[in-house]
């Protein structure tokens, strides 16, 4: 009869156990909803702000065609300005055409004058070829106009209405590039 | 937080292949481009491949036509193809997400290129 008792009892003890952990793992689960909760309407916010807003491009940038430009207000060197851009969800200018190279070199006339401006062209250590950041070859008439007397790694910038090379470790300012949203109107 | 959780790293022959994979879970809404590093022994981190949220890729320059970065935006994740690997490659592989706040990185993976 003791022995019944106490099986009774062991058997009741670690159905509590198991209850307990129910309850934790619901108040566990109970938190990491209300913290995704909290997450979804941060995000929903962000969305409707952005809808509300719906400028193809965001404060700051300027627009041409299907392109967003943003121009720098720091100096940094050619990685560093590589990541700022990426933070922002962009890269570093990748100019395609003459006329975006005019668009480009008439905007910073109006903006800040004859500056140094990091893009996104980099010269090959071994080839000596330059590319693009996505792989690609510039056009003919879109080559850095001097070649660099360097060591190290050599990197495109855009300066009055050129296209130039220099040590990537200088320090200048630098233009980042997105696509613009399209409007859904 | 976002946290970055890389696989795919191990050992290859020279000339060989590799897709690394870097899973993303958490504030992932916060991210505006993803990207992988490396780090070779007693040498410093340095950026491989990235891929804007708008799909736009740029690359190192000793990776270029080697390496292809790609992402699945419905598994939150970002591969890294790795073609005509070279021991020059091996290094531990670190994901890397960009925010307009802080930057956050996965553990990382090894690849060793050696025959």
């Known amino acids: 009869k003791l022995l019944q008792v106490s099986t009774i009892a062991m058997q009741q003890q670690e159905k509590l156990i198991q209850q307990e952990r129910a309850l934790l793992n619901f108040t566990e689960w109970k938190r990491s909803c209300a913290l995704q909760m909290k997450y979804c309407q941060a995000f929903m916010q962000n969305s409707l702000s952005s809808a509300h807003n719906s400028s193809p491009c965001p404060n700051n940038w300027i627009q041409n065609r299907e392109s967003c430009y943003y121009v720098s207000e720091i100096w940094s060197i050619w990685h560093t300005s590589q990541e700022n851009c990426l933070k922002e969800g962009s890269t570093l200018l990748q100019i395609e055409s003459k006329e975006e190279m005019d668009f480009i070199t008439g905007s910073l006339r109006k903006i800040k004058g004859s500056y140094d401006y990091w893009v996104g062209l980099s010269q090959d250590g071994h080839s000596g070829r330059w590319l693009w950041q996505d792989g690609s070859s510039p056009s003919p008439g879109l080559l850095p106009a001097e070649r660099s007397q360097s060591a190290n790694q050599v990197c495109g910038y855009v300066k009055s209405n050129s296209l130039l090379s220099s040590n990537c470790s200088t320090w200048k300012y630098f233009i980042c590039e997105k696509y613009a949203l399209r409007s859904s109107v | 937080d976002v946290q970055l959780v890389e696989s795919g790293g191990g050992l290859v022959q020279p000339g060989g292949s590799l897709r690394l994979s870097c899973a993303a879970s958490g504030r992932i809404f916060s991210v505006n481009a993803m990207g992988w590093y490396r780090q070779a022994p007693g040498k410093q981190r340095e950026l491989v491949a990235a891929?804007?949220?708008?799909?736009?890729?740029t690359y190192a320059d000793s990776v270029k036509g080697r390496f292809t970065i790609s992402r699945d935006n419905s598994k939150n994740t970002v591969y890294l193809q790795m073609n005509s690997l070279r021991p020059e490659d091996t290094a531990v592989y670190y994901c890397?997400?960009?925010?307009?706040?802080?930057?956050?990185w996965g553990q990382g993976t090894l690849v060793t290129v050696s025959s």
């Open positions: 891929i804007t949220n708008q799909g736009a890729p």
């Open positions: 890397k997400a960009f925010t307009r706040g802080d930057d956050y």
